[in-house]
Amino acid sequence: NFMYSKTVKRLSKLREYQQYHPSLTCVMEGKDIEDWSCCPTPWTSFQSSCYFISTGMQSWTKSQKNCSVMGADLVVINTREEQDFIIQNLKRNSSYFLGLSDPGGRRHWQWVDQTPYNENVTFWHSGEPNNLDERCAIINFRSSEEWGWNDIHCHVPQKSICKMKKIYI
């Protein structure tokens, strides 16, 4: 009876997500058979989040809209470990929008989810950011410095990375 009601709850939760994500990949969290964490297929998972590399080339605003339609945001990178995970799935000859922008061109960078911008946890390429006209951030590969961030014009189409919280059922 308990298992039945738990299954019904899970099914209704899954239906909620079905409009955006017809398929979920779930793993058992810990030893408790009742706790499952899921990411949409084919998103990847790291810690408590799911990530999707969008290969369509769009402006920063359209990229953010595209993520939000899927219940996500452009990626907010909080740690070096998170960035190290993300770059495993990126192509070296491409650039990807992050959820980081400077809307007023005053060098006041802000994350899309309002996470406070912390200068000490940023991974800008050396000499970046460096242009008041370039108000959106990308992550890209430079042979001298590996992966890092760069400021670019927001209207220039790029690939992007979406991030959402894991779905717990």
């Epitope: 007023g104 061109g105 060098r107 460096n130 242009n131 008041l132 006209d133 108000r135």
Partner: antibody, heavy 118, light 107 residues
Framework: QVQLQQSGAELVGPGVSVKISCKGS????????MHWVKQSHAKSLEWIGV????????NYNQKFKGKATMTVDKSSSTAYMELASLTSEDSAIYFC???????????WGQGTLVTVSA | DLQMTQTPSSLSASLGDRVTISCRAS??????LSWYQEKPDGTFKLLIY???RLHSGVPSRFSGSGSGTDYSLTVRNLEQEDIGTYFC?????????FGGGTKLEIR
């Protein structure tokens, strides 16, 4: 080649306003913000502010808020700066300069001399 | 505002000399330092940006160096066309600020 052509010298009385212009050519005007710089004997060079033709927004040095107003006309690739309530302190050469990466002024106008005199 | 202190305020040198102008910032400016030349006719020209990068068309006689708060511009093999006033400018923190200028004359 990139050129910034500024309007001619102005001789004006105290208390009035003056509007000077800076026409950009040889590049895509909306891709680069325009800065304004004041050169006076007393204070050497001072950054007045910057305007983005693409976004339409401005950023002023606090010192020049209320004194300078920057605008652009995209159709003519021209940036303008209006100086209000002029006093002798405003007598100076005013330059426009194109924004570039590494926070540099890559190209400068030839300057517009503004003289405030009764 | 971030202060830029430029020294000397003027200097006189002979053709072929090597001259150095210094600029000190009131705080670390992360190499976001540019140098400009004001010609005797009042026109401005960018020489060096990001501490040591030569702007296009600028002769290699000009070089820049420095880090943190201390920066310098060096002109080797001084030529007649180098006369004018030189200014440093920081681009680390708004409002951007300039040094007071160094007037270079030929002896």
């Amino acid at each position: 080649q990139v050129q910034l052509q500024q309007s001619g010298a102005e001789l004006v009385g105290p208390g009035v306003s003056v509007k000077i212009s800076c026409k950009g050519s040889g590049y895509t005007f909306t891709d680069y913000s325009m800065h304004w710089v004041k050169q006076s004997h007393a204070k050497s060079l001072e950054w007045i502010g910057v305007i983005s033709p693409y976004y339409g927004d401005t950023n002023y040095n606090q010192k020049f808020k209320g004194k300078a107003t920057m605008t652009v006309d995209k159709s003519s690739s021209t940036a303008y700066m209006e100086l209000a309530s002029l006093t002798s302190e405003d007598s100076a050469i005013y330059f426009c300069a194109r924004n570039d990466d590494y926070y540099r002024f890559a190209y400068w106008g030839q300057g517009t001399l503004v003289t405030v005199s009764a | 505002d971030l202060q830029m202190t430029q020294t000397p305020s003027s200097l006189s040198a002979s053709l072929g000399d090597r001259v150095t102008i210094s600029c000190r910032a009131s705080q670390d400016i992360n190499n976001y330092l540019s140098w400009y030349q004001e010609k005797p006719d009042g026109t401005f020209k960018l020489l060096i940006y990001y501490t040591s990068r030569l702007h296009s068309g600028v002769p290699s006689r000009f070089s820049g160096s420095g880090s943190g708060t201390d920066y310098s511009l060096t002109v080797r093999n001084l030529e007649q066309e180098d006369i004018g006033t030189y200014f440093c400018q920081q681009g680390k923190t708004l409002p951007w600020t300039f040094g007071g200028g160094t007037k270079l004359e030929i002896r």
